[in-house]
Protein backbone atom coordinates (compact mmCIF):
# COMPACT_ATOMS: atom_id res chain seq x y z
CA UNK A 1 0.00 0.00 0.00
CA UNK A 2 1.23 3.52 -0.85
CA UNK A 3 2.53 5.66 1.99
CA UNK A 4 -0.07 7.97 3.52
CA UNK A 5 -0.32 11.48 2.08
CA UNK A 6 -2.03 14.40 3.82
CA UNK A 7 -4.03 16.39 1.30
CA UNK A 8 -5.04 20.01 1.99
CA UNK A 9 -6.74 20.90 -1.30
CA UNK A 10 -7.22 24.61 -0.59
CA UNK A 11 -4.12 26.78 -0.78
CA UNK A 12 -6.13 29.62 0.72
CA UNK A 13 -9.54 30.27 2.22
CA UNK A 14 -11.10 33.67 2.80
CA UNK A 15 -13.82 34.12 5.41
CA UNK A 16 -15.75 37.12 6.70
CA UNK A 17 -15.30 37.93 10.37
CA UNK A 18 -18.02 36.29 12.46
CA UNK A 19 -18.54 33.42 10.04
CA UNK A 20 -17.17 29.87 10.20
CA UNK A 21 -14.12 28.70 8.28
CA UNK A 22 -13.96 25.18 6.86
CA UNK A 23 -10.44 23.86 6.46
CA UNK A 24 -10.29 20.72 4.35
CA UNK A 25 -7.94 17.80 4.99
CA UNK A 26 -8.01 14.21 3.81
CA UNK A 27 -5.52 11.38 4.11
CA UNK A 28 -4.87 8.80 1.41
CA UNK A 29 -4.39 5.82 3.70
CA UNK A 30 -5.67 4.42 6.99
CA UNK A 31 -2.13 3.45 7.95
CA UNK A 32 -0.47 4.22 10.29
CA UNK A 33 -2.83 4.37 13.26
CA UNK A 34 -2.58 7.68 15.05
CA UNK A 35 -4.26 11.02 15.60
CA UNK A 36 -4.64 14.01 13.35
CA UNK A 37 -3.77 17.41 14.77
CA UNK A 38 -4.31 20.86 13.30
CA UNK A 39 -1.83 23.66 13.88
CA UNK A 40 -1.64 27.32 12.99
CA UNK A 41 1.83 28.15 11.82
CA UNK A 42 4.84 25.91 11.56
CA UNK A 43 7.93 25.23 13.63
CA UNK A 44 8.35 25.05 17.39
CA UNK A 45 6.05 28.00 18.08
CA UNK A 46 3.10 26.55 16.14
CA UNK A 47 -0.27 26.81 17.86
CA UNK A 48 -2.42 23.72 18.41
CA UNK A 49 -5.89 24.32 17.01
CA UNK A 50 -7.37 20.83 17.28
CA UNK A 51 -6.20 17.45 18.54
CA UNK A 52 -8.25 14.43 17.55
CA UNK A 53 -6.98 12.54 20.55
CA UNK A 54 -7.66 14.87 23.46
CA UNK A 55 -8.37 18.38 24.61
CA UNK A 56 -11.26 20.81 24.55
CA UNK A 57 -11.59 22.96 21.45
CA UNK A 58 -14.96 24.73 21.77
CA UNK A 59 -14.74 26.61 18.45
CA UNK A 60 -13.66 23.59 16.41
CA UNK A 61 -15.90 20.85 15.07
CA UNK A 62 -15.02 18.01 12.73
CA UNK A 63 -16.88 17.99 9.44
CA UNK A 64 -17.16 14.19 9.31
CA UNK A 65 -17.35 11.35 11.88
CA UNK A 66 -13.63 11.50 12.60
CA UNK A 67 -13.69 9.12 15.59
CA UNK A 68 -14.01 6.05 13.39
CA UNK A 69 -11.06 4.14 12.01
CA UNK A 70 -12.33 4.14 8.41
CA UNK A 71 -12.55 7.93 8.32
CA UNK A 72 -10.12 9.65 5.99
CA UNK A 73 -11.62 13.15 6.13
CA UNK A 74 -10.20 15.32 8.87
CA UNK A 75 -11.64 18.64 7.75
CA UNK A 76 -12.55 21.02 10.53
CA UNK A 77 -14.83 24.00 10.95
CA UNK A 78 -13.73 26.91 13.12
CA UNK A 79 -16.62 29.08 14.30
CA UNK A 80 -16.86 32.82 14.91
CA UNK A 81 -13.75 33.77 12.97
CA UNK A 82 -11.95 36.98 13.95
CA UNK A 83 -8.98 38.71 12.28
CA UNK A 84 -6.77 37.15 14.97
CA UNK A 85 -7.46 33.73 13.42
CA UNK A 86 -5.68 34.60 10.18
CA UNK A 87 -2.67 32.46 9.34
CA UNK A 88 -1.59 29.21 7.71
CA UNK A 89 -3.20 26.07 9.07
CA UNK A 90 -1.53 22.66 8.81
CA UNK A 91 -3.21 19.26 9.05
CA UNK A 92 -0.68 16.87 10.56
CA UNK A 93 -0.87 13.07 10.84
CA UNK A 94 0.79 11.47 13.87
CA UNK A 95 1.79 7.87 14.42
CA UNK A 96 0.40 6.30 17.59
CA UNK A 97 3.00 5.61 20.24
CA UNK A 98 4.71 6.85 23.38
CA UNK A 99 4.82 9.63 22.49
CA UNK A 100 2.81 10.03 19.32
CA UNK A 101 5.27 11.05 16.61
CA UNK A 102 4.67 13.36 13.68
CA UNK A 103 4.32 11.30 10.54
CA UNK A 104 3.31 13.67 7.76
CA UNK A 105 1.99 17.21 7.32
CA UNK A 106 -0.27 18.74 4.74
CA UNK A 107 0.97 21.66 2.63
CA UNK A 108 -1.08 24.15 4.63
CA UNK A 109 -4.10 26.34 4.00
CA UNK A 110 -3.80 30.09 4.41
CA UNK A 111 -6.83 31.54 6.15
CA UNK A 112 -7.47 35.20 5.46
CA UNK A 113 -10.19 37.01 7.33
CA UNK A 114 -12.31 39.65 5.70
CA UNK A 115 -13.05 42.18 8.42
CA UNK A 116 -15.09 45.31 7.91
CA UNK A 117 -13.50 48.67 8.62
CA UNK A 118 -14.91 50.59 11.55
CA UNK A 119 -17.06 53.63 10.81
CA UNK A 120 -14.71 56.41 9.69
CA UNK A 121 -14.20 59.11 12.31
CA UNK A 122 -13.52 62.57 10.92
CA UNK A 123 -11.98 65.21 13.12
CA UNK A 124 -11.16 68.80 12.33
CA UNK A 125 -8.80 71.36 13.81
CA UNK A 126 -8.93 72.14 17.51
CA UNK A 127 -9.41 75.86 16.88
CA UNK A 128 -11.70 77.65 14.48
CA UNK A 129 -10.28 79.25 11.36
CA UNK A 130 -11.46 82.06 9.14
CA UNK A 131 -12.27 82.03 5.43
CA UNK A 132 -9.32 81.85 3.01
CA UNK A 133 -7.41 79.77 5.52
CA UNK A 134 -6.48 76.14 4.86
CA UNK A 135 -7.48 73.67 7.57
CA UNK A 136 -6.69 69.98 8.00
CA UNK A 137 -9.19 67.19 8.60
CA UNK A 138 -8.24 63.68 9.62
CA UNK A 139 -10.15 60.48 8.95
CA UNK A 140 -9.47 57.20 10.74
CA UNK A 141 -10.87 53.70 10.32
CA UNK A 142 -9.64 50.52 11.97
CA UNK A 143 -9.83 46.75 12.12
CA UNK A 144 -10.20 45.88 8.45
CA UNK A 145 -8.72 43.04 6.45
CA UNK A 146 -7.49 42.49 3.79
CA UNK A 147 -5.23 45.53 3.53
CA UNK A 148 -6.58 46.90 0.23
CA UNK A 149 -8.87 49.84 0.88
CA UNK A 150 -9.96 53.02 -0.91
CA UNK A 151 -10.48 56.36 0.83
CA UNK A 152 -11.94 59.47 -0.76
CA UNK A 153 -12.64 62.98 0.53
CA UNK A 154 -15.56 65.17 -0.47
CA UNK A 155 -16.67 68.69 0.32
CA UNK A 156 -20.35 69.16 -0.37
CA UNK A 157 -20.26 66.30 -2.87
CA UNK A 158 -17.18 67.57 -4.68
CA UNK A 159 -14.20 65.25 -4.49
CA UNK A 160 -11.09 66.69 -2.90
CA UNK A 161 -7.62 65.98 -4.19
CA UNK A 162 -5.33 67.49 -1.56
CA UNK A 163 -4.96 64.66 0.93
CA UNK A 164 -2.46 62.09 2.18
CA UNK A 165 -3.36 58.57 3.28
CA UNK A 166 -1.48 55.86 5.19
CA UNK A 167 -2.46 52.25 5.85
CA UNK A 168 -0.76 50.63 8.86
CA UNK A 169 1.02 48.42 9.49
CA UNK A 170 3.07 48.22 6.30
CA UNK A 171 3.79 44.47 6.75
CA UNK A 172 1.55 41.47 7.30
CA UNK A 173 -1.01 41.85 10.07
CA UNK A 174 -4.27 40.34 11.23
CA UNK A 175 -5.99 43.68 10.65
CA UNK A 176 -5.18 47.16 9.43
CA UNK A 177 -5.92 50.83 10.08
CA UNK A 178 -6.16 53.76 7.70
CA UNK A 179 -5.34 57.38 8.48
CA UNK A 180 -5.87 60.21 6.06
CA UNK A 181 -5.37 63.98 6.28
CA UNK A 182 -7.13 66.33 3.88
CA UNK A 183 -6.53 70.05 3.40
CA UNK A 184 -9.59 72.26 2.90
CA UNK A 185 -9.66 75.96 2.02
CA UNK A 186 -12.48 77.70 3.88
CA UNK A 187 -14.85 80.18 2.26
CA UNK A 188 -17.40 82.54 3.83
CA UNK A 189 -20.18 80.28 2.53
CA UNK A 190 -18.95 77.17 4.38
CA UNK A 191 -21.10 77.34 7.51
CA UNK A 192 -23.46 74.76 6.03
CA UNK A 193 -20.71 72.79 4.32
CA UNK A 194 -19.73 69.22 5.15
CA UNK A 195 -16.48 67.38 4.72
CA UNK A 196 -17.02 63.66 4.06
CA UNK A 197 -14.52 60.83 4.30
CA UNK A 198 -15.64 57.77 2.32
CA UNK A 199 -14.10 54.33 2.80
CA UNK A 200 -14.63 51.48 0.32
CA UNK A 201 -13.56 47.91 1.14
CA UNK A 202 -14.24 44.45 -0.25
CA UNK A 203 -16.28 43.58 2.86
CA UNK A 204 -18.73 46.42 2.28
CA UNK A 205 -20.19 45.01 -0.96
CA UNK A 206 -20.07 48.31 -2.78
CA UNK A 207 -21.75 50.27 0.01
CA UNK A 208 -18.98 52.51 1.37
CA UNK A 209 -18.83 53.81 4.91
CA UNK A 210 -18.86 57.54 5.48
CA UNK A 211 -17.72 59.82 8.22
CA UNK A 212 -18.65 63.49 8.22
CA UNK A 213 -17.52 66.72 9.79
CA UNK A 214 -19.59 69.89 9.71
CA UNK A 215 -17.56 72.95 8.83
CA UNK A 216 -19.84 74.88 11.18
CA UNK A 217 -17.65 73.44 13.95
CA UNK A 218 -14.48 74.63 12.22
CA UNK A 219 -15.20 77.97 10.59
CA UNK A 220 -15.32 81.43 12.09
CA UNK A 221 -16.76 84.12 9.82
CA UNK A 222 -15.87 87.53 11.28
CA UNK A 223 -18.58 90.17 11.16
CA UNK A 224 -18.70 93.29 9.02
CA UNK A 225 -19.75 96.40 10.90
CA UNK A 226 -21.68 99.43 9.70
CA UNK A 227 -22.60 102.34 11.95
CA UNK A 228 -25.32 104.68 10.67
CA UNK A 229 -27.10 107.68 12.05
CA UNK A 230 -30.86 108.20 11.70
CA UNK A 231 -32.96 111.00 13.20
CA UNK A 232 -35.96 110.11 15.33
CA UNK A 233 -39.23 112.00 15.89
CA UNK A 234 -38.27 113.42 19.26
CA UNK A 235 -36.52 116.75 18.92
CA UNK A 236 -32.73 116.69 19.42
CA UNK A 237 -32.63 112.86 19.49
CA UNK A 238 -30.58 110.81 17.05
CA UNK A 239 -30.75 107.06 16.56
CA UNK A 240 -27.33 105.52 15.90
CA UNK A 241 -27.35 101.87 14.75
CA UNK A 242 -24.56 99.36 14.50
CA UNK A 243 -25.29 96.68 11.92
CA UNK A 244 -23.30 93.50 12.61
CA UNK A 245 -23.50 91.36 9.50
CA UNK A 246 -22.53 87.91 8.28
CA UNK A 247 -20.87 86.47 11.37
CA UNK A 248 -20.54 82.90 12.66
CA UNK A 249 -20.72 81.45 15.27
CA UNK A 250 -23.32 83.45 17.18
CA UNK A 251 -21.10 84.15 20.20
CA UNK A 252 -20.72 87.93 20.06
CA UNK A 253 -20.46 90.81 22.48
CA UNK A 254 -20.98 94.42 21.49
CA UNK A 255 -19.84 97.50 23.40
CA UNK A 256 -20.81 101.10 22.65
CA UNK A 257 -18.15 103.69 23.42
CA UNK A 258 -18.89 107.39 23.74
CA UNK A 259 -15.74 109.37 23.17
CA UNK A 260 -13.82 106.28 24.22
CA UNK A 261 -15.80 105.62 27.36
CA UNK A 262 -17.90 102.49 27.72
CA UNK A 263 -21.50 103.35 27.41
CA UNK A 264 -23.16 99.95 27.20
CA UNK A 265 -22.21 96.27 26.66
CA UNK A 266 -24.58 93.66 25.38
CA UNK A 267 -24.53 90.10 24.08
CA UNK A 268 -26.06 89.07 20.77
CA UNK A 269 -29.33 87.32 21.48
CA UNK A 270 -32.13 87.89 19.01
CA UNK A 271 -30.16 87.37 15.81
CA UNK A 272 -31.41 86.74 12.31
CA UNK A 273 -29.98 83.89 10.28
CA UNK A 274 -28.93 84.25 6.68
CA UNK A 275 -29.38 81.56 4.06
CA UNK A 276 -25.68 80.75 4.19
CA UNK A 277 -25.88 80.06 7.93
CA UNK A 278 -24.25 83.28 9.08
CA UNK A 279 -26.00 85.70 11.42
CA UNK A 280 -26.97 89.39 11.40
CA UNK A 281 -27.61 91.55 14.44
CA UNK A 282 -28.29 95.19 15.07
CA UNK A 283 -27.80 97.39 18.09
CA UNK A 284 -28.71 101.03 18.45
CA UNK A 285 -28.37 104.04 20.69
CA UNK A 286 -30.68 107.07 21.13
CA UNK A 287 -28.47 110.10 21.49
CA UNK A 288 -29.74 113.41 22.90
CA UNK A 289 -27.59 115.84 20.98
CA UNK A 290 -28.79 118.88 22.91
CA UNK A 291 -26.87 117.62 25.90
CA UNK A 292 -23.60 117.93 24.02
CA UNK A 293 -21.65 121.06 23.22
CA UNK A 294 -19.00 119.25 21.22
CA UNK A 295 -19.12 116.54 18.56
CA UNK A 296 -19.53 113.00 19.91
CA UNK A 297 -17.44 110.07 18.65
CA UNK A 298 -19.55 106.91 18.93
CA UNK A 299 -17.78 103.61 18.55
CA UNK A 300 -19.39 100.19 18.03
CA UNK A 301 -16.87 97.63 19.29
CA UNK A 302 -17.51 93.95 18.67
CA UNK A 303 -15.75 91.00 20.22
CA UNK A 304 -16.65 87.90 18.20
CA UNK A 305 -16.05 84.35 19.41
CA UNK A 306 -13.28 85.37 21.80
CA UNK A 307 -11.25 87.11 19.08
CA UNK A 308 -9.67 90.58 19.38
CA UNK A 309 -12.30 93.29 19.13
CA UNK A 310 -13.12 95.04 15.88
CA UNK A 311 -14.76 98.45 15.86
CA UNK A 312 -16.39 101.04 13.69
CA UNK A 313 -16.85 104.67 14.70
CA UNK A 314 -19.26 107.40 13.80
CA UNK A 315 -18.79 111.12 14.47
CA UNK A 316 -21.99 112.72 15.62
CA UNK A 317 -22.03 116.45 14.81
CA UNK A 318 -23.82 118.32 17.56
CA UNK A 319 -22.78 121.95 16.82
CA UNK A 320 -24.70 122.57 13.62
CA UNK A 321 -28.46 122.62 13.13
CA UNK A 322 -29.71 120.00 15.57
CA UNK A 323 -33.26 120.74 14.55
CA UNK A 324 -32.49 119.92 10.94
CA UNK A 325 -31.03 116.65 12.03
CA UNK A 326 -34.21 115.85 13.83
CA UNK A 327 -36.51 116.80 10.97
CA UNK A 328 -36.04 113.49 9.08
CA UNK A 329 -38.31 110.52 9.59
CA UNK A 330 -37.12 108.50 12.55
CA UNK A 331 -36.61 104.71 12.62
CA UNK A 332 -38.89 102.68 14.86
CA UNK A 333 -37.48 102.19 18.32
CA UNK A 334 -38.06 98.81 19.91
CA UNK A 335 -36.84 100.04 23.21
CA UNK A 336 -34.66 97.05 23.90
CA UNK A 337 -31.45 98.76 22.82
CA UNK A 338 -32.45 102.28 23.77
CA UNK A 339 -29.75 104.50 25.17
CA UNK A 340 -30.13 108.19 25.93
CA UNK A 341 -27.02 110.32 26.32
CA UNK A 342 -27.42 113.42 28.44
Amino acid sequence: EEELQVIQPDKSVSVAAGESAILHCTVTSLIPVGPIQWFRGAGPARELIYNQKEGHFPRVTTVSESTKRENMDFSISISNITPADAGTYYCVKFRKGSPDTEFKSGAGTELSVRAKPSAPVVSGPAARATPQHTVSFTCESHGFSPRDITLKWFKNGNELSDFQTNVDPVGESVSYSIHSTAKVVLTREDVHSQVICEVAHVTLQGDPLRGTANLSETIRVPPTLEVTQQPVRAENQVNVTCQVRKFYPQRLQLTWLENGNVSRTETASTVTENKDGTYNWMSWLLVNVSAHRDDVKLTCQVEHDGQPAVSKSHDLKVSAHPKEQGSNTAAENTGSNERNIY
Partner: antibody, heavy 118, light 107 residues
Protein backbone atom coordinates in the same frame (compact mmCIF):
# COMPACT_ATOMS: atom_id res chain seq x y z
CA UNK B 1 -26.27 -2.93 11.85
CA UNK B 2 -22.60 -3.52 12.67
CA UNK B 3 -22.18 -7.15 13.67
CA UNK B 4 -19.45 -9.70 14.34
CA UNK B 5 -20.28 -13.42 14.59
CA UNK B 6 -17.66 -15.96 15.67
CA UNK B 7 -17.76 -19.65 14.79
CA UNK B 8 -15.47 -22.72 14.80
CA UNK B 9 -15.12 -23.29 18.52
CA UNK B 10 -15.35 -26.69 20.12
CA UNK B 11 -13.57 -29.39 22.00
CA UNK B 12 -10.07 -30.29 20.90
CA UNK B 13 -7.32 -32.45 22.37
CA UNK B 14 -4.06 -30.93 23.55
CA UNK B 15 -1.65 -30.57 20.63
CA UNK B 16 -4.58 -30.34 18.23
CA UNK B 17 -5.63 -27.52 15.90
CA UNK B 18 -8.73 -25.42 15.44
CA UNK B 19 -9.67 -22.61 13.04
CA UNK B 20 -11.96 -19.87 14.28
CA UNK B 21 -13.88 -17.62 11.91
CA UNK B 22 -15.47 -14.22 12.41
CA UNK B 23 -18.05 -12.99 9.92
CA UNK B 24 -18.34 -9.21 9.76
CA UNK B 25 -21.31 -7.23 8.45
CA UNK B 26 -22.65 -3.68 8.45
CA UNK B 27 -19.31 -1.94 7.85
CA UNK B 28 -16.40 -1.71 5.40
CA UNK B 29 -14.40 -4.62 6.77
CA UNK B 30 -11.21 -3.78 4.86
CA UNK B 31 -10.96 -0.39 6.57
CA UNK B 32 -10.51 -1.70 10.11
CA UNK B 33 -7.88 -3.47 12.14
CA UNK B 34 -9.31 -6.66 13.62
CA UNK B 35 -8.52 -8.40 16.90
CA UNK B 36 -9.00 -11.65 18.79
CA UNK B 37 -9.43 -11.53 22.58
CA UNK B 38 -10.02 -14.52 24.84
CA UNK B 39 -11.44 -15.07 28.30
CA UNK B 40 -10.90 -18.23 30.33
CA UNK B 41 -14.01 -19.17 32.28
CA UNK B 42 -14.36 -17.01 35.39
CA UNK B 43 -11.22 -15.04 34.58
CA UNK B 44 -10.24 -11.79 32.93
CA UNK B 45 -9.72 -10.74 29.33
CA UNK B 46 -6.54 -11.51 27.39
CA UNK B 47 -5.56 -10.06 24.00
CA UNK B 48 -4.61 -12.80 21.54
CA UNK B 49 -3.89 -11.27 18.15
CA UNK B 50 -4.31 -8.30 15.81
CA UNK B 51 -4.29 -8.01 12.04
CA UNK B 52 -3.93 -4.56 10.54
CA UNK B 53 -5.54 -3.10 7.46
CA UNK B 54 -2.42 -3.88 5.47
CA UNK B 55 -2.20 -7.43 6.78
CA UNK B 56 0.44 -6.78 9.45
CA UNK B 57 0.01 -9.19 12.38
CA UNK B 58 0.75 -9.08 16.10
CA UNK B 59 0.72 -11.72 18.88
CA UNK B 60 1.60 -11.94 22.56
CA UNK B 61 4.46 -14.24 23.55
CA UNK B 62 2.01 -16.85 24.92
CA UNK B 63 0.68 -17.75 21.45
CA UNK B 64 3.44 -16.59 19.11
CA UNK B 65 4.49 -19.34 16.74
CA UNK B 66 1.36 -21.40 17.44
CA UNK B 67 -1.43 -19.06 16.29
CA UNK B 68 -1.81 -17.27 12.98
CA UNK B 69 -4.32 -14.54 12.14
CA UNK B 70 -5.60 -13.82 8.64
CA UNK B 71 -8.34 -11.89 6.89
CA UNK B 72 -10.26 -12.26 3.66
CA UNK B 73 -11.61 -8.81 2.86
CA UNK B 74 -13.65 -10.02 -0.10
CA UNK B 75 -15.59 -12.30 2.24
CA UNK B 76 -15.63 -9.87 5.19
CA UNK B 77 -14.03 -12.62 7.23
CA UNK B 78 -11.41 -12.85 9.96
CA UNK B 79 -9.68 -16.09 10.94
CA UNK B 80 -7.59 -17.44 13.80
CA UNK B 81 -5.67 -20.61 13.11
CA UNK B 82 -4.70 -22.25 16.40
CA UNK B 83 -2.12 -25.03 16.39
CA UNK B 84 -0.38 -26.96 19.19
CA UNK B 85 -3.26 -26.17 21.51
CA UNK B 86 -2.78 -26.44 25.27
CA UNK B 87 -5.18 -26.68 28.19
CA UNK B 88 -4.29 -23.06 29.00
CA UNK B 89 -5.83 -21.98 25.68
CA UNK B 90 -9.27 -23.00 26.92
CA UNK B 91 -11.44 -19.87 26.81
CA UNK B 92 -14.22 -18.00 25.09
CA UNK B 93 -12.68 -16.36 22.00
CA UNK B 94 -14.05 -13.01 20.91
CA UNK B 95 -13.37 -11.21 17.69
CA UNK B 96 -13.41 -7.42 17.99
CA UNK B 97 -13.12 -4.48 15.66
CA UNK B 98 -10.52 -1.75 16.15
CA UNK B 99 -13.23 0.69 15.26
CA UNK B 100 -11.90 3.97 16.57
CA UNK B 101 -9.28 6.12 14.89
CA UNK B 102 -6.80 5.01 17.57
CA UNK B 103 -7.57 1.26 17.10
CA UNK B 104 -9.59 1.04 20.31
CA UNK B 105 -11.93 -1.95 20.31
CA UNK B 106 -15.47 -0.74 19.78
CA UNK B 107 -17.52 -3.74 18.57
CA UNK B 108 -17.30 -7.29 19.91
CA UNK B 109 -18.76 -10.57 18.74
CA UNK B 110 -20.72 -12.81 21.09
CA UNK B 111 -17.78 -15.22 21.43
CA UNK B 112 -17.11 -18.89 20.67
CA UNK B 113 -16.00 -21.44 23.25
CA UNK B 114 -12.78 -23.37 22.75
CA UNK B 115 -12.06 -26.25 25.11
CA UNK B 116 -8.70 -28.00 25.04
CA UNK B 117 -8.96 -31.25 26.96
CA UNK B 118 -8.12 -34.87 26.64
CA UNK C 1 4.96 -6.02 28.67
CA UNK C 2 2.91 -3.27 30.26
CA UNK C 3 1.09 -4.38 33.40
CA UNK C 4 -2.35 -2.93 34.12
CA UNK C 5 -3.49 -2.93 37.75
CA UNK C 6 -7.11 -2.19 38.65
CA UNK C 7 -8.41 -1.30 42.06
CA UNK C 8 -10.47 -2.29 43.84
CA UNK C 9 -10.93 -5.87 42.64
CA UNK C 10 -14.51 -5.75 43.84
CA UNK C 11 -16.80 -3.01 45.02
CA UNK C 12 -20.23 -2.96 46.68
CA UNK C 13 -22.43 0.06 46.08
CA UNK C 14 -26.06 1.12 46.10
CA UNK C 15 -28.31 2.45 43.37
CA UNK C 16 -27.72 6.21 43.02
CA UNK C 17 -24.14 6.04 44.31
CA UNK C 18 -21.21 7.62 42.51
CA UNK C 19 -18.36 5.17 42.11
CA UNK C 20 -14.79 5.44 40.88
CA UNK C 21 -12.57 2.63 39.60
CA UNK C 22 -8.86 3.22 39.10
CA UNK C 23 -6.39 1.70 36.69
CA UNK C 24 -2.62 2.06 36.85
CA UNK C 25 -0.20 1.26 34.02
CA UNK C 26 3.36 0.13 34.70
CA UNK C 27 4.59 2.76 32.24
CA UNK C 28 3.30 5.77 30.35
CA UNK C 29 0.65 4.67 27.84
CA UNK C 30 0.08 8.12 26.33
CA UNK C 31 -3.65 8.05 27.15
CA UNK C 32 -4.30 5.02 24.92
CA UNK C 33 -6.56 3.50 27.53
CA UNK C 34 -10.02 1.96 27.11
CA UNK C 35 -12.70 0.88 29.59
CA UNK C 36 -15.11 -2.01 29.03
CA UNK C 37 -18.20 -3.27 30.83
CA UNK C 38 -19.00 -6.98 30.88
CA UNK C 39 -22.06 -8.71 32.24
CA UNK C 40 -22.13 -12.46 32.96
CA UNK C 41 -22.36 -14.59 29.81
CA UNK C 42 -22.10 -11.53 27.54
CA UNK C 43 -19.36 -9.99 25.42
CA UNK C 44 -17.56 -6.91 26.70
CA UNK C 45 -19.01 -3.55 25.74
CA UNK C 46 -16.81 -0.54 24.98
CA UNK C 47 -17.39 2.53 27.19
CA UNK C 48 -14.39 4.84 26.89
CA UNK C 49 -11.39 5.20 24.58
CA UNK C 50 -8.31 7.43 24.70
CA UNK C 51 -8.83 7.71 28.45
CA UNK C 52 -11.73 10.15 28.31
CA UNK C 53 -13.61 9.90 24.99
CA UNK C 54 -17.09 8.44 25.34
CA UNK C 55 -17.83 5.66 22.90
CA UNK C 56 -20.82 6.37 20.65
CA UNK C 57 -24.13 5.48 22.30
CA UNK C 58 -22.72 5.26 25.84
CA UNK C 59 -24.62 7.34 28.42
CA UNK C 60 -22.84 10.39 29.83
CA UNK C 61 -23.03 9.05 33.40
CA UNK C 62 -19.83 7.22 32.43
CA UNK C 63 -16.71 9.34 32.32
CA UNK C 64 -13.02 8.66 32.08
CA UNK C 65 -10.07 10.74 33.17
CA UNK C 66 -6.36 10.58 33.85
CA UNK C 67 -3.14 10.66 31.89
CA UNK C 68 0.28 9.08 31.81
CA UNK C 69 -0.05 6.03 34.06
CA UNK C 70 -3.06 6.74 36.32
CA UNK C 71 -6.63 6.61 35.07
CA UNK C 72 -10.13 6.49 36.51
CA UNK C 73 -13.58 5.44 35.40
CA UNK C 74 -16.43 7.21 37.17
CA UNK C 75 -20.11 6.26 37.13
CA UNK C 76 -22.02 9.26 38.40
CA UNK C 77 -25.26 7.68 39.53
CA UNK C 78 -25.48 3.89 39.64
CA UNK C 79 -28.49 2.18 38.11
CA UNK C 80 -29.35 -1.54 38.45
CA UNK C 81 -28.05 -2.22 34.93
CA UNK C 82 -24.61 -0.85 35.82
CA UNK C 83 -23.74 -3.74 38.15
CA UNK C 84 -21.14 -5.68 36.13
CA UNK C 85 -17.41 -6.26 35.82
CA UNK C 86 -15.30 -3.41 34.42
CA UNK C 87 -11.95 -3.80 32.64
CA UNK C 88 -9.33 -1.30 31.59
CA UNK C 89 -7.04 -1.97 28.63
CA UNK C 90 -3.94 -0.29 27.28
CA UNK C 91 -3.55 -0.32 23.51
CA UNK C 92 -0.56 1.95 23.22
CA UNK C 93 2.00 -0.82 22.82
CA UNK C 94 1.84 -4.47 21.70
CA UNK C 95 1.09 -6.72 23.41
CA UNK C 96 -2.16 -5.02 24.36
CA UNK C 97 -2.96 -5.79 28.00
CA UNK C 98 -6.04 -5.69 30.24
CA UNK C 99 -6.47 -5.01 33.92
CA UNK C 100 -7.68 -7.95 36.03
CA UNK C 101 -11.17 -6.44 36.33
CA UNK C 102 -13.31 -4.77 39.01
CA UNK C 103 -16.53 -6.48 39.97
CA UNK C 104 -19.21 -3.95 40.91
CA UNK C 105 -21.85 -5.58 43.08
CA UNK C 106 -25.12 -4.31 44.52
CA UNK C 107 -25.01 -3.61 48.23
Amino acid sequence: EVQLVESGGGLVQPGGSLRLSCAASGFTFSSFDMHWVRQPTGKGLEWVSTIGIAGDTYFPGSVKGRFTISRENAKNSLYLQMNSLRAGDTAVYYCARGGNWDDALDIWGQGTMVTVSS
Amino acid sequence: DIQMTQSPSSLSASVGDRVTITCRASQDINNYLAWFQQKPGKAPKSLIYTASSLQSGVPSKFSGSGSGTDFTLTISSLQPEDFATYYCQQYNTYPYTFGQGTKLEIK
